[in-house]
């Protein structure tokens, strides 16, 4: 008789999850010489240990500490790019501008990007059928706690000018409930971070509005200013052209004519 299994509202663990994490770890450590010392089997064991046999609504940041320790990585603190609701463009950007880093350009972010996982209380099984949904089931689920933990650490490491890419096509350009709004903003360290610069990415070809005047951006400015960090905002009217100009800054079509 099959054992009764909790039905959650969210999708189950990504198929071939253990193999995917292990393969990503091997690939990342091969590409990044500074992480060659990492033992990927130990990384997988620590990752697994964070959620296997635990109730998937009762995961804590503490559960992920062994994984955090193994994945400790130094990125240039003044080259950090945060993003909210515009992951693809942020990743395209750091692929072009190789000295800047999103969270997913670090080992731990790379391992978990776009994956889902959860276990079951008191069994060593991975649940491939369903996992808790943040809204409908519980917030202390394995995936949400992981991203909260790594996002907090990433923000805490930032210094000087920190950049954030925001989606200007959304009704809330800055969303207090996003990972950026609820975790990263509050974990930037005022003694290290001088300025947060927002890049508001426009969606429409002919959209020349100043989205830096949007009420949600003003709300972000207020939160940041209260934390004694300066705030700056730029409209990226043409993200396609912007990427092209980042790739080739000498291109005359990027530059105003005298």
């Amino acid at each position: 008789v099959p054992r009764w299994r909790q039905q959650w509202s969210g999708p189950g663990t990504t198929k071939r999850f253990p193999e995917t994490v292990l393969a990503r770890c091997v690939k990342y450590t091969e590409i990044h010489p500074e992480m060659r010392h990492v033992d990927c089997q130990s990384v997988w064991d620590a990752f697994k240990g964070a959620f296997i046999s635990k109730h998937p609504c009762n995961i804590t940041e503490e559960d992920y500490q062994p994984l955090m320790k193994l994945g400790t990585q130094t990125v240039p603190c003044n080259k950090i790019l945060l993003w909210s609701r515009i992951k693809d463009l942020a990743h395209q950007f750091t692929q072009v501008q190789r000295d800047m880093f999103t969270l997913e350009d670090t080992l731990l972010g790379y391992l978990a990007d776009d994956l889902t996982w959860c276990g079951e209380f008191n069994t060593s099984k991975i649940n491939y059928q369903s996992c808790p949904d943040w809204r409908k089931d519980c917030s202390n689920n394995p995936v949400s706690v992981f991203w909260k933990t790594v996002s907090r650490r990433f923000a805490e490491a930032a210094c000087d000018v920190v950049h954030v890419m925001l989606n200007g096509s959304r009704s809330k350009i800055f969303d207090k409930n996003s990972t950026f709004g609820s975790v990263e903003v509050h974990n930037l360290q005022p003694e290290k971070v001088q300025t947060l610069e927002a890049w508001v990415i426009h969606g429409g070809r002919e959209d020349s509005r100043d989205l830096c005047q949007d009420p949600t951006i003003k709300e972000l400015e207020s939160i940041i200013s209260k934390r004694n960090i300066q705030f700056s905002c730029k409209n990226i009217y043409r993200p396609d052209k912007f990427l092209q100009c980042v790739k080739n800054p000498e291109d005359s079509s990027c530059t105003s004519e005298i």
């Epitope: 800047m100 950049h163 610069e197 009217y237 043409r238 000498e250």
Partner: nanobody, 118 residues
Framework: QVQLVESGGGLVQAGGSLRLSCVAS????????MGWYRQAPGKQRELVAT???????NYADSVKGRFTISRDNAQNTVYLQMNNLKPEDTAIYYC????????????WGQGTQVTVSS
């Protein structure tokens, strides 16, 4: 807005020299073509000199042969050496990215006042 801090302006007699400096913090300034702009009273802001991240320069006809733009990428600093100054050079001088405003919007610093007396 502290990401662009211009300095070096002042009062100088016609024929004199000044060297303006601009410290620019933030990614867009570090890789983009940078420009020195000026705005005289009652006139529109105009671009007078540009320098690409690779060091290629361009000048407005009115300043050619008198002004020299340079940059120190390691220090995120852009300079404008102004020689043989004329009264018509009197303006507030600003530095900023010279990328087209149809691509990226500009946020301005407070500029530095240059006054040339005859």
């Amino acid at each position: 807005q502290v990401q662009l801090v211009e300095s070096g302006g002042g009062l100088v007699q016609a024929g004199g020299s000044l060297r303006l400096s601009c410290v620019a913090s933030g990614f867009i300034y570090s890789i983009s073509t940078m420009g020195w702009y000026r705005q005289a009273p009652g006139k529109q802001r105009e671009l007078v000199a540009t320098i690409t991240s690779g060091g290629n320069t361009n000048y407005a006809d009115s300043v050619k042969g008198r002004f020299t733009i340079s940059r120190d990428n390691a220090q995120n600093t852009v300079y404008l050496q102004m020689n043989n100054l004329k009264p018509e050079d009197t303006a507030i001088y600003y530095c900023n990215t010279a990328w087209r405003e149809t691509i990226v919007s500009r946020v301005w610093g407070q500029g530095t006042q240059v006054t040339v007396s005859s």
